[in-house]
Interface confidence: medium
């Protein structure tokens, strides 16, 4: 049993890491492995993840961690039985991805404007919260063509958008996520997508 | 029993290149991790490089950072390093050693060749 | 990179005595290190993996001891054999570093 792509880890900077990795062949992630992963720091315990299978190969196993601060670093060391297979360090602030952002509610009765909004995913005291930009994803359910996305690089969780940009009488849906520069971080995962009924008075034309 | 046979050592000039080749067996070979080590005449062991079982994950020491290369055929059994942009200071007996571990540096060296002379001077 | 900063470089001692050769590591290297011996026109030997693991068919008169981040081999009474290299090996994260080399001498 071997390790053919090393584990690679991402953490929400708050709570959960996750790492990734595939085997040199099918394998049963929670019963023949085990990854070891420990602070660098005095006096901190190790702790055990049990890994689940990602796919025939591939496990995946999420480490839950304190809150994390950028100077922290864990040791990994992944088991199988009494065997090491790998061992390596991840350092959770050099590998941030943040958690999707919720609650996405698209507000229509604001006269001809729409207005999305939605839930930033970090408590006000993480330090993620005040630094998060978005993106936000609109596309018609009925014409793949109409696809588009709109740079939310305001903190504020909400973009407004005049509903004549948007195709009258067919339905929308919107999805967001989140990055933050300062940690250089990759994109989150997308929200769940919210669907509404796009529908405004056009403007009378004069002949 | 472990058996590493080193070869393709010798007297090359400055700024030329070599291949060195590490035959082994006795053991299953792509179950495990294997690197280079030399020694200078009368000085210490240095690590040069290492190898993951399947060659994929890579290590050199800086002092042969971007002029040379690990590389291994499984299918041969065999351990490779290309070494180009020779200098002086690259004179040595050059050994080839098995690892403990299969995905780089678990246990260091636990199998040692009897190793290669490379002499680099003009 | 990690260093490793081994001491004494060289030691003269009898057969019967006890030696202790020290290596510390520049930053924490958990106990990811080994203990070779190397005679003159000789391959590396493997006496110690995992900092206090014997390798198989290494006299148990060879022990390793670590404490934070200084290491030690100790023979517990040197044999005539026993003459010969010591070199610690980093073996934590790459660039693998080995220390400089303790040179155990006949008295």
């Known amino acids: 049993m071997k390790v053919l792509q090393e584990p690679t880890c991402v953490s929400d900077y708050m709570s959960i890491s996750t790492c990734e990795w595939k085997m040199n062949g099918p394998t049963n992630c929670s019963t023949e492995l085990r990854l070891l992963y420990q602070l660098v720091f005095l006096l901190s315990e190790a702790h055990t993840c049990i890994p689940e299978n990602n796919g025939g190969a591939g496990c995946v196993c999420h480490l839950l961690m304190d809150d994390v601060v950028s100077a922290d670093n864990y040791t990994l060391d992944l088991w199988a039985g009494q065997q090491l297979l790998w061992k390596g360090s991840f350092k959770p602030s050099e590998h941030v991805k943040p958690r999707a952002p919720g609650n996405l509610t698209v507000h229509t009765n604001v006269s001809d404007t729409l207005l999305l909004t939605w839930s930033n995913p970090y408590p006000p005291d993480n330090y993620l919260y005040n630094h998060l930009t978005y993106a936000v994803n609109i596309w018609s359910e009925n014409d793949p063509a109409d696809f588009r996305i709109y740079n939310v690089t305001y903190l504020e969780p909400s973009l407004r958008i005049a509903a004549s940009t948007l195709k009258s009488g067919i339905s929308y849906r919107a999805r967001v996520r989140a990055w933050a520069q300062c940690y250089n971080t990759t994109w989150s995962e997308w929200s769940p997508s919210t669907k509404w009924h796009n529908s405004y008075r056009e403007p009378f034309e004069q002949h | 029993e472990v058996q590493l046979v080193e070869s393709g050592g010798g007297l090359v000039q400055p700024g030329r290149s070599l291949r060195l080749s590490c035959a082994a067996s006795?053991?299953?070979?792509?179950?495990?991790?294997m690197h280079w080590v030399r020694q200078a005449p009368g000085k210490g062991l240095e690590w040069v490089s290492g190898?993951?079982?399947?060659?994929?994950?890579?290590g050199y020491a800086d002092s042969v950072k971007g002029r040379f290369t690990i590389s291994r055929d499984n299918a041969k059994n065999s351990l490779y390093l290309q070494m180009n942009s020779l200098r002086a200071e690259d004179t040595a007996f050059y050994y080839c050693?098995?690892?403990?571990?299969?995905?780089?540096?678990?246990?260091?060296?636990?199998?040692w060749g009897q190793g290669t002379t490379v002499t680099v001077s003009s | 990179d990690i260093q490793m900063t081994q001491s004494p470089s060289s030691l003269s001692a009898s057969v019967g005595d006890r030696v202790t050769i020290t290596c510390r590591a520049s930053q924490g290297i958990r106990n990811d290190l080994g203990w070779y011996q190397q005679k003159p026109g000789k391959d590396p030997k493997r006496l110690i993996f995992?900092?206090?693991n014997l390798h198989g068919g290494v006299p148990s008169r060879f022990s390793g001891g670590v404490s934070g981040t200084e290491f030690t081999l100790t023979i517990s009474s040197l044999q005539p054999e026993d003459f010969a290299t010591y070199y610690c090996l980093q073996h934590n994260s790459y660039p693998l570093t080995f220390g400089g080399g303790t040179k155990v001498e006949i008295k």
């Open positions: 190898v993951n079982w399947n060659g994929v994950s890579l």
């Open positions: 050693a098995k690892d403990s571990g299969s995905y780089h540096y678990y246990y260091g060296m636990d199998g």
């Open positions: 995992a900092a206090t």
């Open positions: 006795g053991f299953t070979f792509d179950d495990y991790a």
